[in-house]
Each structure stands twice: as C-alpha cells, then as structure tokens.
C-alpha cells in the first residue's frame, strides 16, 4: 500500500538507505511530502516485522515499486493519514 503521510513531527529520517527490501517483507510505504514539517520528501518503509526503514527517494528499486503502485491505484488516490 502506498500512503501519503502527514505528520507534525519534524523530519523522521536522518539516514536513508538504498539497500533493496524485497516486496514480501514490505507492509506499507509512507511518503511524507516536502514542506510537511521537513524540508525534504521522505520515504518510510514499514516492514512486516514492524521495523521501519528510511529509503533514499533516488533509489531505483523504490522508484520502480512506487511507479507500479501508482499505476495500480491510479483510479483511487492514496488516503491521507493524520
């Protein structure tokens, strides 16, 4: 599931990883848009074991997954979570 995530927390990510995470381990991908308490866009992957990983938005693998998910859900936009 791709989710646009709004938070009052300042940046959640300090270090970002480019390491590939297999889709079978991914529960949800949260995107925090730039300017939402943080000057940069953040991509947070929730793994099924409840660990959270900050992913480099430029990582090829995350861009591929996000593009695929966007196409899949193009009829219904991501649900904002507050």
């Amino acid at each position: 599931v791709l989710e646009v995530y709004y938070t009052h927390l300042r940046c959640r990510c300090v270090q970002e990883s480019s390491v590939f995470i297999p889709r079978r381990f991914i529960d949800r991908i949260q995107i925090s848009p730039r300017g939402n308490g943080c000057p940069r866009k953040e991509i947070i992957v929730w793994k099924k074991n409840k660990s959270v990983v900050c992913v480099d938005p430029q990582a090829e693998w995350i861009q591929r997954i996000m593009e695929m998910l966007r196409k899949k859900s193009s009829s219904t936009p991501p649900v904002p979570v507050f």
Epitope: R12, K47, V52
Partner: antibody, heavy 123, light 111 residues
Framework: QVQLQESGPGLVKPSETLSLTCTVS??????????VGWIRQPPGKGLEWIAH???????RYNPALKSRVTISKDTSKNQFSLKLSSVTAADTAVYYC???????????????WGQGTTVTVSS | DIQMTQSPSSLSASVGDRVTITCRAS??????????MHWYQQKPGKAPKLLIF???DLESGVPSRFSGSGSGTDFTLTISSLQPEDFATYYC?????????FGQGTKLEIK
C-alpha cells in the same frame, strides 16, 4: 483528543488472574501503525514495560513476564486488555495503559498515557 | 536486555537552578542515525508524561527550559532554570531493542 482509561478490580488474590481493560478515544486501534500497551509501577519503584499490541494484532511481550501475560484488543469497542496469570504480591503495582506514538514501529515510544489503576495482590 | 542507569537517583535543587540528569545505556540505542532514547516526567500519583523523544526532540507543549542531548549510550536531560512545577521524578526509556526498558528514575526534590 487522545484519551485512555484503565479499569479492573483493585484487589486480586494470589495465584488468580489479574484482568485489566483500557478504553480509548480520539484514535482507532485499527489504524495502520497504531500500537498500544501496558506498563506497570510497583509501589515506590520504577516503570516496567509489560506488553504492547499493534493494529494488525501482532503482540510483543516482556520476556520476564511473557509466560504469564496475554494482551488482546477489541477494535469494535475501542478497548484493549491485559491478563496476568498466577499473580503474587510482587505483581502489586499501578498499571498504566499507553498509546505508542506511531512513527517508528518497533522503535517507538509512549506518547499518551492513561491515569493508571492500582492493583493489590493479597488474600 | 538493554540496562538503563540514571544518575543521580535523587537530587536536591532550588528554583532557578540549572539541573542535569544523566542516563547511560548498557549498549548503543542508536539506529538509522537516530537515538531512540526518550524522557518522561512523573509527579506523585500521576501518570508519566512524555517530555523528550529521540534524545533531543521536545514534545509539543513542553516548556523550552527542558532539553535533551546525547547519542550512543550516554544521554542527558537538562532543565535550564528550575520552576516549582518541575519537582518530580524523571525517567529515561530506550526503544531501540525489545524489551523496551526504563531507567530507575531520578527524583528531583526542593532544597
């Protein structure tokens, strides 16, 4: 606003099972990333994490108590519960329910707390 | 388990004083460049209240006289100018590894 309220018997006999319920408002137990849990504080002592449960029913327990503890939730009632079996006087404490912040999953913190309920174990 | 050791266990101070409480973890609580160390304030008969999360982030509504610092295993909570309402017990907590663990507490008393 976020609120949590503990309820349950104030007195439990040794060897019996302690049962507590936390009723929540201002948030849903089924929202993605939501976690809630229990912490206790024996008289005059510090805080001890007991257990927490996630939106998807995944449960995490303190290994020191795991064999005696069960945490569960009823999303339709906005409640979650704690059961602690085979209690002894050492389980006498104030029991708090709390909500996890919801930002870092298994590395999160307790952002909201109930006011606590005192449980005494005595015959 | 990660052991959390606070010092001092009790402390007497006066209104206006600058106070520092330390918390040492038995192993690093850092991950992803973040220190998963949090501080709570507890007044007698009340529930703990979150003051600081991620070692140095001030919880909304908490006065700016409270600050936190540190990384790895060593952390401090500082109150820059003690107010009467600050006399309480303070706890650190780590959440980098299960089980989440708390320090034993530091009781801040009026001198």
């Amino acid at each position: 606003q976020v609120q949590l309220q503990e309820s349950g018997p104030g007195l439990v006999k040794p060897s019996e099972t302690l049962s507590l319920t936390c009723t929540v408002s201002g948030f849903s137990l089924s929202t993605f990333g939501m976690g809630v849990g229990w912490i206790r504080q024996p008289p005059g002592k510090g805080l001890e994490w007991i257990a927490h449960i996630w939106w998807d029913d995944d449960r995490r327990y303190n290994p020191a108590l795991k064999s005696r503890v069960t945490i569960s939730k009823d999303t339709s009632k906005n409640q979650f519960s704690l059961k602690l079996s085979s209690v002894t006087a050492a389980d006498t404490a104030v029991y708090y329910c709390a909500r996890i912040a919801g930002y870092y999953g298994s590395r999160d913190w307790f952002a909201y707390w109930g006011q606590g309920t005192t449980v005494t174990v005595s015959s | 388990d990660i052991q959390m050791t606070q010092s001092p266990s009790s402390l007497s101070a006066s209104v206006g004083d600058r106070v520092t409480i330390t918390c040492r973890a038995s192993e690093s609580v850092d991950n992803m460049g973040i220190s998963f160390m949090h501080w709570y304030q507890q007044k007698p008969g009340k529930a703990p209240k979150l003051l600081i999360f991620r070692a140095s982030d001030l919880e909304s509504g908490v006065p700016s006289r409270f600050s936190g610092s540190g990384s790895g295993t060593d952390f401090t909570l500082t109150i820059s100018s003690l107010q009467p309402e600050d006399f309480a017990t303070y706890y650190c907590q780590q959440s980098n590894k299960d089980p989440w663990t708390f320090g034993q507490g530091t009781k801040l008393e009026i001198k």
